[in-house]
Interface confidence: medium
């Protein structure tokens, strides 16, 4: 019996087609992805093959103005239109709290939404009961297939699930659910989830009875043969893991942003054992036409976005200095604003000992591309912010050793004065530079805001201490020469869309007046 698994993950609000790098589509003839094009390919395969499942491994939420405006309603609407068979919850599905998941998505989806390792407690338990499931048995042709879901156990530190959801260890939580499916005589089981490629492989190895793992979270690109675009494969597709009980378990993921449609063909014997598996992600390029009915629907939903772009998010009563003459040379108040927004977006009360789990932000001055003039009635719009942060990046959470941070600040001024982008803007950090000293030895003072304290105050950076820091994904990936961050980071979790973080903060504050306040000094 043959099953075709079509899968997506980490689509992150890319409902419209995008450029090859998943940013805003500029030249339509070279654009990729988008739900209209995805639908064309899915329908083509559904017509050609008998047993097809369309699955999503989480993180549909967060990434473009579509999510900012529609808050998940767009996800439910277009996933329903594409007739997805199941979805696993990703960490970003909790970005607007549990309510922001329940109302727009869980209540509106016509397909099962899954996670076996999220357990609701307290008053939420009855409210959310039945809206998401640990597993679902789906009829496919003459057979049944069990889909069991999982979500990153780190979600409480990456998003806003609140205190009434417990995120258990994936493997511990999955095994009893798979065992339950076996007792129900379901002998073909797919683990669908959002914990990253390493956890996907562990699940394949350790969870008895899982036949296939379809994952997300790590944006992993797998491919057999010559890859069709810029992504470099992390391994072959499918990636085969030998389980502890000796089975060959295919593990797949389909990069991110709707650029590819994962395509996996599995052959099962009559006892539900995988006999063979093969396939590849399909690049959704312009050779695949956009479905006209879905495209028309997209255009209808787009109107509200265009209106939103020019609406006032909040006001500034001061000039927001995002000029390169300031932000690449000294502390600038636009940098302070963005860093304050980044920290605010990551407020997660950890326990009674910590006021927050993270207090620090760094931001390359070169990533700030425009000022905002307060003389336009103080109005700040999404359009204004898109000029400041045009690259469509994310603000991510990393863990770094103090010594790595010190190296980063030395790099910040190693060729000071040449208007280069690596000059760091900061939040929760006080740094003093002495430019008369030789490069690599210019940081004379580096104090950081405590997290394990009831009254936050600045203490000297400890070289051997481990710190959490919010920064642009560009820096986490070693951009602007910050190789030491990429090489030495101890953990990296991707975060929210940069513009969205700042726009949410401005909307929340209503009126802003960021100052230059001595975060960066020169002795």
């Amino acid at each position: 019996w043959e099953l075709t698994i079509l899968h997506t993950n980490d689509v992150h609000s890319r409902l419209e087609q995008t450029s090859e790098d998943s940013s805003k589509c500029v030249n339509a003839s070279r654009c990729m992805g988008g739900v209209a094009r995805l639908f064309t390919k899915v329908q083509q395969i559904r017509r050609a093959e008998p047993n097809v499942l369309l699955l999503d491994a989480g993180d549909q939420y967060q990434g473009t103005i579509w999510f900012t405006v529609y808050k998940g309603a767009e996800v439910a609407h277009f996933m329903n239109a594409l007739r997805y068979d199941a979805m696993a919850l990703g960490n970003h599905e909790f970005d607007n709290g549990v309510e922001g998941l329940i109302e727009p998505l869980l209540k509106e989806a016509k397909f099962p939404i899954l996670s076996a390792n999220i357990k609701a407690k307290g008053p939420l338990a009855s409210q959310i009961s039945g809206l998401y499931l640990p597993y679902k048995v789906l009829p496919v042709g003459d057979e049944v297939v069990g889909i069991v879901g999982y979500t990153s156990k780190e979600t409480p530190f990456l998003s806003n699930p609140g205190t009434n959801l417990v995120f258990e260890d994936e493997i511990t939580a999955l095994q009893p659910e798979v065992d339950k499916l076996k007792t129900l005589n379901v002998n073909k089981i797919i683990a669908l989830g959002h914990s990253g490629f390493e956890t996907d492989k562990l699940i394949a190895q350790k969870v008895r009875g899982v036949d296939v793992v379809v994952g997300g979270h790590s944006n992993t690109f797998l491919y057999t043969g010559n890859p069709p675009s810029k992504e470099v494969p992390a391994g072959k597709y499918p990636f085969i893991v030998t389980s502890d009980d000796g089975r060959k378990v295919p593990v797949v993921q389909a990069y991110a942003f709707g650029k590819y449609l994962g395509y996996l063909k599995i052959e099962f014997d009559e006892r539900g054992n995988v006999i063979s598996s093969h396939g590849n992600p399909i690049l959704l390029n312009s050779s695949i036409p956009e479905d006209p009915s879905i495209k028309a629907d997209i255009n209808k939903w787009r109107i509200k976005l265009d209106n939103y772009s020019t609406q006032e998010l909040g006001k500034t009563i001061v000039y927001l200095d995002g000029s390169s003459q300031s932000c690449r040379f000294r502390e600038c108040n636009m940098g302070n604003l963005i860093c304050d927004a980044m920290i605010n977006n990551n407020l997660r009360h950890a326990d009674e000992m910590f006021w927050n789990h993270v207090s620090m932000c760094i931001l390359n001055g070169g990533g700030i591309r425009s000022p905002i003039d307060e003389r336009n009635n103080g109005t700040i719009t999404w359009e204004n912010l898109a000029a400041v942060l045009p690259f469509g990046g994310t603000f991510d959470l990393v863990q770094l050793k103090g010594s790595t941070l010190k190296k980063a600040f030395e790099h910040s001024v190693h060729r000071y004065g040449q208007s280069t982008g690596e000059f760091l803007q900061v939040g929760g950090i006080h740094v003093v530079y002495d430019l008369s000293r030789k490069p690599g030895d210019r940081v004379v003072k580096l104090d950081v805001l405590c997290t394990k304290c009831r009254v936050p105050s600045y203490d000297p950076l400890k070289m051997d201490e481990i710190y959490k820091v919010i920064l642009p994904n560009f820096l986490a990936n070693g951009g602007d020469g910050f190789q030491m961050i990429k090489d030495e980071l101890l953990r990296h979790d991707s975060g929210d869309q940069d513009i969205n973080v700042v726009s949410t903060y401005i909307s929340k504050m209503k009126v802003i007046y960021p100052a230059v306040e001595g975060r960066i000094k020169f002795s």
Epitope: E198, A234, A350, H357, V358, Q399, K452, K462, E488
Partner: antibody, heavy 120, light 111 residues
Amino acid sequence: QVQLQQPGTELVNPGASVKLSCKASGYTFTSYWMHWVKQRPGQGLEWIGNINPSNGGTHYNEKFNNKATLTVDKSSSTAYMQLSSLTSEDSAVFYCARGDYAYDWYFTVWGTGTTVTVSS
Amino acid sequence: DIVLTQSPASLAVSLGQRAIISCKASQSVSFAGTGLMHWYQQKPGQQPKLLIYRVSNLEAGIPTRFSGSGSRTDFTLNIHPVEEDDAATYYCQQNREFPWTFGGGTKLEIK
């Protein structure tokens, strides 16, 4: 089956250097940090340092800064630790170890250990 | 460096009874609400084996006779009921701050 294979013994002269190997199999070598741990006869465990095989990034216990150098060979999925200027204090079992997740710093998989004896 | 002090250095427990091993850290090993303390078992001539990670999570395949608890600076490994096979040296380990450090070990003997 995730495995870390280490040679059983190394006999070296005082003042010399030795390069210990740890061959990984059963998983994507570049996806997990590799750690090294020292255990002197009848003593406890000491963390030496770790290396990120995907890009060579390292962290050392300062105590071993001028003693140990960690490297990897991605093509053979092998991690190496070079120990220099050996003395009797360096006679010990040296383990390589790996965590369950890319960024977990507890060790679920251990090599069998290489016993280094420094003696003339 | 964070110093981990294990006590007792050795203990003898009768079959079926409870063994309690303590590990005290010189400073808190909690990080944003998570205790970064782990426990290993080592038998003579063998490599260490992970029992419990992040204070209380049982590693896959480890019997439920083993349990961990504690927070901040004080942590405990419990074994109950003790079996013959549990004779070994037990180590705690922290990864709150570089360098990662281990406790001095507790040798468990079965009476």
